[in-house]
Interface confidence: low
């Protein structure tokens, strides 16, 4: 038995940060989960996690640079990611592994979601063009 | 280096009880799930009982579920079974166990041997 997760198939970051909100067809009240977020079509970089236990605080750490962090709903782990730069412009999968109560649960590979990283460009408003040269 | 020293084994009475230490180093014990199983003389391997990070979810085999009790203090990174109404068929080497996943583990101790004998 898996877990089914759902995700937007595709999110821009204006701003250099994203909500992505991994919604799973399993209830995480009460269960100790991880839940993490990887990059690429291999899933090969693991972006964020978010560990959680009912009775502990909710954790939430990336090892590999990425500025994060992770809101919990009932059904949802909300990844929230700042900083990013535009080729880091890929998909991003959702992952949930459910190890207590068992059964050990985890989930059906997703569709993803394509994170489109819009840089900033500091140029100046063409209301504004600044002082003009004599 | 992980490492996972049971202690605690012995030879005890029917119905007599025993409790179990795993003290755990090498590793954030705080971090992982444990676990306790164990091998009967010319048996395979039973598991018994796993334990969250927390201390607060467990699980029990059917065999060991109302006399057997999983508990953990992570402040001293040591995992503990309480074993009362013991049986001649809990005769058996209890080891401690770091959990990877449900009922998987990456990481075993030496072992205790648990005697019940009259």
């Known amino acids: 038995n898996k877990i089914l997760v759902k995700q937007s198939p595709m999110l821009v970051a204006y701003d250099n940060a994203v909500n992505l909100s991994c919604k799973y067809s399993y209830n995480l009240f009460s269960r100790e989960f991880r839940a993490s977020l990887h990059k690429g079509l291999d899933s090969a970089v693991e972006v964020c996690v978010v560990y959680g236990n009912y009775s502990q605080q909710l954790q939430v750490y990336s090892k590999t640079g990425f500025n994060c962090d992770g809101k919990l709903g009932n059904e949802s782990v909300t990844f929230y990611l700042q900083n990013l730069y535009v080729n880091q412009t890929d998909i991003y999968f959702c992952k949930i592994e459910v190890m207590y109560p068992p059964p050990y649960l985890d989930n059906e590979k997703s569709n993803g979601t394509i994170i489109h990283v819009k840089g900033k460009h500091l140029c100046p408003s063409p209301l504004f063009p600044g002082p003009s040269k004599p | 280096e992980v490492q996972l020293l049971e202690s605690g084994g012995g030879l005890v009475q029917p119905g007599g009880s025993l409790r179990l230490s795993c003290a755990a180093s090498?590793?954030?014990?705080?971090?992982?799930?444990m676990a306790w199983v164990r091998q009967a003389p010319g048996k395979g391997l039973e598991w018994v009982s796993n334990i969250g990070r927390a201390g607060s979810v467990t699980y029990y085999a059917d065999s060991v579920k109302g006399r057997f009790t999983i508990s953990r203090d992570n402040s001293k990174n040591t995992l503990y079974l309480q074993m009362n109404s013991l049986r001649a068929e809990d005769t058996a080497v209890y080891y401690c166990?770091?959990?990877?996943?449900?009922?998987?583990?990456?990481?075993w101790g030496q072992g205790t041997l648990v005697t019940v004998s009259s």
């Open positions: 166990a770091k959990v990877q996943s449900w009922r998987t583990f990456d990481y």
């Open positions: 090498g590793f954030t014990f705080e971090n992982y799930g």
